[in-house]
Interface confidence: low
Amino acid sequence: QDSPPQILVHPQDQLFQGPGPARMSCQASGQPPPTIRWLLNGQPLSMVPPDPHHLLPDGTLLLLQPPARGHAHDGQALSTDLGVYTCEASNRLGTAVSRGARLSVAVLREDFQIQPRDMVAVVGEQFTLECGPPWGHPEPTVSWWKDGKPLALQPGRHTVSGGSLLMARAEKSDEGTYMCVATNSAGHRESRAARVSIQEPQDYTEPVELLAVRIQLENVTLLNPDPAEGPKPRPAVWLSWKVSGPAAPAQSYTALFRTQTAPGGQGAPWAEELLAGWQSAELGGLHWGQDYEFKVRPSSGRARGPDSNVLLLRLPEKVPSAPPQEVTLKPGNGTVFVSWVPPPAENHNGIIRGYQVWSLGNTSLPPANWTVVGEQTQLEIATHMPGSYCVQVAAVTGAGAGEPSRPVCLLLEQAMERATQEPSEHGPWTLEQLRATLKR
């Protein structure tokens, strides 16, 4: 008896680790037996070379290799998300749609967010070696090595928090070279080696007056960028504070600042910067589009006074200061696929909320633009005739669209049987190459 399709085996989320193909399973019942088709991010897969997807007779989808979406080794942001796959089973009585399964790729970037630094600690006192592991998917775990061997963590003496190593009481035997190692299924990364020297405590008397100092951080003002710093300066702020208590016991003041985490989240470690001032000073090297917490700490020699109150400052977002990278145009079945990689993280200048894609005039596409919202880094454009297709892509933050990529073009021949990419080893054409060919 005839029956509509029903999904029996749904595809499952998985991590693409290679080198072999990734498999997505889908099994369905129904009479007549249903035909299976797969969709990626809601778009049907063509299964026609050079599409890396291949459909097996039992409905299983093979992904022979992940699309070229950037390289973990080039230090650029990499989209780990290859997309959400769904399968559809259809016969003349209807269609059944599976649950979506996300395929993502294991990535571990090279660049540590914070590298451990050489430091001098005092016997009996605590010290911290900072380490911000590189961004990775899945999130990397952090281990510490000392003098080339894994560090045996002693409860109560060693604590690893957010990657940083906290030593409760320094001992002479803690002297040595430390390295932070980040590991996930994509591999591992080693930080720079940091030299830790341990000194015996010196006889000194801590100025008691310093403990009586109260600092009130009164203002944190965003400074107007200095034109001499070029067109894309990092933001700087002006801190001003008031000191009350004993007469000028502090020899210096240090700014402590960090990006504000979401409420309830564990606070980021405080960065420290010696300030060139006794009541106010400039602090630079911040990032646009971030919320910062600031406080000031007085010190005199090795003695430190109590921290000031905390002030918050929301640095406005700016447009991204670099274009999306690795923009590619590929022919599809009656469509052109545009894909790209986000700009480098240091050029985001806020949260990238999406991308703007322009087609350029004087080609087969009339001048038009599309908005891609969210983290998606690809776009499918319908094409109705052979000819040249040229696009530019720009990343968008809350402040607007940033610098566009340089135009990338693709020449589609009659009936879109094949795409002319001349010279083939150079991939998609630039606008200049295309114009030269059309003149010929």
């Epitope: 009164e218 203002n219 944190v220 003002t221 965003l222 702020v237 409420p263 309830g264 989240g265 606070g267 919320d291 917490e293 109150n309 905390v310 002030l311 918050l312 400052l313 929301r314 640095l315 406005p316």
Partner: antibody, heavy 124, light 107 residues
Amino acid sequence: EVQLVESGGGLVQPGGSLRLSCAASGFTINGYYIHWVRQAPGKGLEWVGFIYPAGGDTDYADSVKGRFTISADTSKNTAYLQMNSLRAEDTAVYYCARLIGNKFGWSSYGMDYWGQGTLVTVSS
Amino acid sequence: DIQMTQSPSSLSASVGDRVTITCRASQDVSTAVAWYQQKPGKAPKLLIYSASFLYSGVPSRFSGSGSGTDFTLTISSLQPEDFATYYCQQSRSDHPTFGQGTKVEIK
């Protein structure tokens, strides 16, 4: 001397509209976050929303989102609270208040100057 | 939104008493807490900001402490003018929230 003065309160029917003003003196509102806070009769304080005139930044409590709009006229050094589709539960004394600090961004965990408040009564 | 729970909701005390009011946040708010005093028919007045910093012009008998989720306002020696309602407020999130208030009455 720093001062905030609210005005524009009164009796309005449910579904009606009202615009409150918060006139500032002794400082320019452009560099500060100005918040609106309300207090229903015999009840506690409830945050309504804020504006940061220099950046045009605004945000609202969920209870008023879509009905209330905060704006500012920096030439008049005044912030406004436009209240539409008023309900009986919006009946309260409305205060405007200034966040401590003079900087780009909300800051410093405290509202140091408050207006005297203006009473809004929503009743048929 | 982050909830701020104050206790007690009211208390009776005498002049010279030491009074402690507590405030608990529903999640970590760092030191983003302020305390206000409000008298009937008047606007709130800022006493403490950043959890422990005395606002200028506020008598030193008022003090604040705490970080994370638990905060305390202490009046070391209650004066006649201190009988009022006290509110805590967090500004760790974009949507500030207030405690429900603690009324300090004369015993």
